[in-house]
Amino acid sequence: YHGCPSECTCSRASQVECTGARIVAVPTPLPWNAMSLQILNTHITELNESPFLNISALIALRIEKNELSRITPGAFRNLGSLRYLSLANNKLQVLPIGLFQGLDSLESLLLSSNQLLQIQPAHFSQCSNLKELQLHGNHLEYIPDGAFDHLVGLTKLNLGKNSLTHISPRVFQHLGNLQVLRLYENRLTDIPMGTFDGLVNLQELALQQNQIGLLSPGLFHNNHNLQRLYLSNNHISQLPPSVFMQLPQLNRLTLFGNSLKELSPGIFGPMPNLRELWLYDNHISSLPDNVFSNLRQLQVLILSRNQISFISPGAFNGLTELRELSLHTNALQDLDGNVFRMLANLQNISLQNNRLRQLPGNIFANVNGLMAIQLQNNQLENLPLGIFDHLGKLCELRLYDNPWRCDSDILPLRNWLLLNQPRLGTDTVPVCFSPANVRGQSLIIINVNVAVPSVHVPEVPSYPETPWYPDTPSYPDTTSVSSTTELTSPVEDYTDLTTIQVTDDRSVWGMTQAQSG
């Protein structure tokens, strides 16, 4: 195909791929009609003047995973048709000024995973058609004002995984078309008021894994189109009352791994489209009434691994669409009988690793669609008669690691469990803790007469059997997997996956997967 270098493969579709450690310079001659050129995993260390001069029809150029550390300013001369240029995963520390001059058609520029120490306004001043700029995984410590001023058409900017300690409030001011801004894994401690004011079309803002301690009250007030806001793994101890007030399109908010002690009233709202709220790994100690009442479409609420010891009876008011509620690994001892009554669509509740000593008999009275209940590792000695009777869809119930008291009062529960054994799972069954003579024996097969020989055991009505449908999939809802799992985080690494499957790690988690960011 018009002379393909021996180190490369060339396809009919005008695609050229050159790979291998033997390659130490750009192979020649390259086919004049090449439209896509990939130079991958070579030992090329520099690009000299005009190595691509004879392939002016080139549209995509990937020079990735090489030893590239030096580029001559005229390296990309004569590539006026180039739309996609990737120099990712090389060893570039410096970009020569004017390197991208003449690349008038360039839309995507990937400079990620290099060792760039700085960028200057002159670097990108010629790239007026650029839509995507990837700078993540470099060593940038600051972004000078004006660096992006000419990139008015930019829709995606990734500055994640750098060493940024502060951001100028003016650096993004001309990026009115930006839809995605990623600043994750930097060293930002605060973000000045006004930093995001010009980003009126922003849909995703990733600020996770920084050291942000305080959010300015009006920080997001101009970002009315924001859909995904990632604030996890920072040092946020307080949320200003109005900080999320102007975000009507938001559908995912992550705040896990911060230092939140309380959720101020009205903090979440109105957010009519929010579907997921991730709050685990904070220091929240109580949930007042109506704290989530503006989140009418919320489906996933993760409050695990906090210090919650009190939930007000109206804390979950308004959450009529909630499917998954994670409260595991907290300090709950009591639950008011009305606390879950609004959660008519709840499918999965995790309450494991708390200090619950008893449950109200009507705790699940309105929650008819429950499919999975995690109650393991609490202080439960018995459960009220009929607590699960109406839960016809229940297919997963975890009761192990509780100090079950196997006296005559346990009979109704024992009988119900006997009839509904498949729901308990096969890994760990509940065992008796007392009396001493039956400690360690399975609650399901225990002979209660043996446990308390001196007590006459009356005929106790058993828990009526709820039908068990072995053919019913546990989670027909596509956003769920086994309820004993919970991702460490909603996926924020921007892979192309739409669903992440996770494996069971009961000691830490207790919910479902999420979908990729």
């Epitope: 009352p241 309380e262 101020s264 009233p265 009205g266 109580s286 007042p288 009434d289 109506n290 704290v291 009442s293 007000s312 009876p313 109206g314 008011n317 001892q333 009591d334 008011d336 009988g337 009305n338 009554r341 000593r357 008893q358 109200p360 008999g361 009507n362 705790i363 009220p384």
Partner: antibody, heavy 118, light 107 residues
Framework: QVQLVQSGAEVKKPGASVKVSCKAS????????INWVRQAPGQGLEWMGW????????KYAQKFQGRVTMTVDTSTSTVYMELSSLRSEDTAVYYC???????????WGQGTLVTVSS | DIQMTQSPSSLSASVGDRVTITCKAS??????VAWYQQKPGKAPKLLIY???YRSSGVPSRFSGSGSGTDFTLTISSLQPEDFATYYC?????????FGGGTKVEIK
Amino acid sequence: QVQLVQSGAEVKKPGASVKVSCKASGYTFTDYYINWVRQAPGQGLEWMGWIYPGSGNTKYAQKFQGRVTMTVDTSTSTVYMELSSLRSEDTAVYYCARWGYGAYFTYWGQGTLVTVSS
Amino acid sequence: DIQMTQSPSSLSASVGDRVTITCKASQNVGINVAWYQQKPGKAPKLLIYSASYRSSGVPSRFSGSGSGTDFTLTISSLQPEDFATYYCQQYNSFPYTFGGGTKVEIK
């Protein structure tokens, strides 16, 4: 229907203790928090704390910490509020009250007048 | 502690009058405010919860509004049985606190 019936009026001397009872009926006693609220003559209402009958867990207002004790007897569906080291300012009507679908007081006892006088 | 400042402390009105009582919280309490009516020698009675929701059996002439720090109880057309003392209460954070009360008297 939910009913909270309190014990009768008490007269106590300063320094003494008083124990007021509140008997609940019409619902599952152990499943809902019960609060105590007091009202001095001609004055407003003051929240004292709550007890969860199912576990006996309590939370007291800082002002009463160390002087108030709330207890429960599940066999009789009764909660008790004991206030010690009484002083004249403790003269008030003491109410037990139960939350409804939120932490507001939907159900009230009839009140118990405690008079502290030498 | 959150202070609930109620005003006026008393008012005189006639049957049929529109009466407005306000309550100001010393900090944001969201919508976690209730209003009670109390008649002499009786326990308080819940009128409004979550700032604006009428308790069951409460006549529609009673309405509540507000959020954050400023709240209002309105009686659209005062009836003879409405002469009583009214209290607001915040239940957003412990200790739960009440306003000082507003006594509604016959003019």
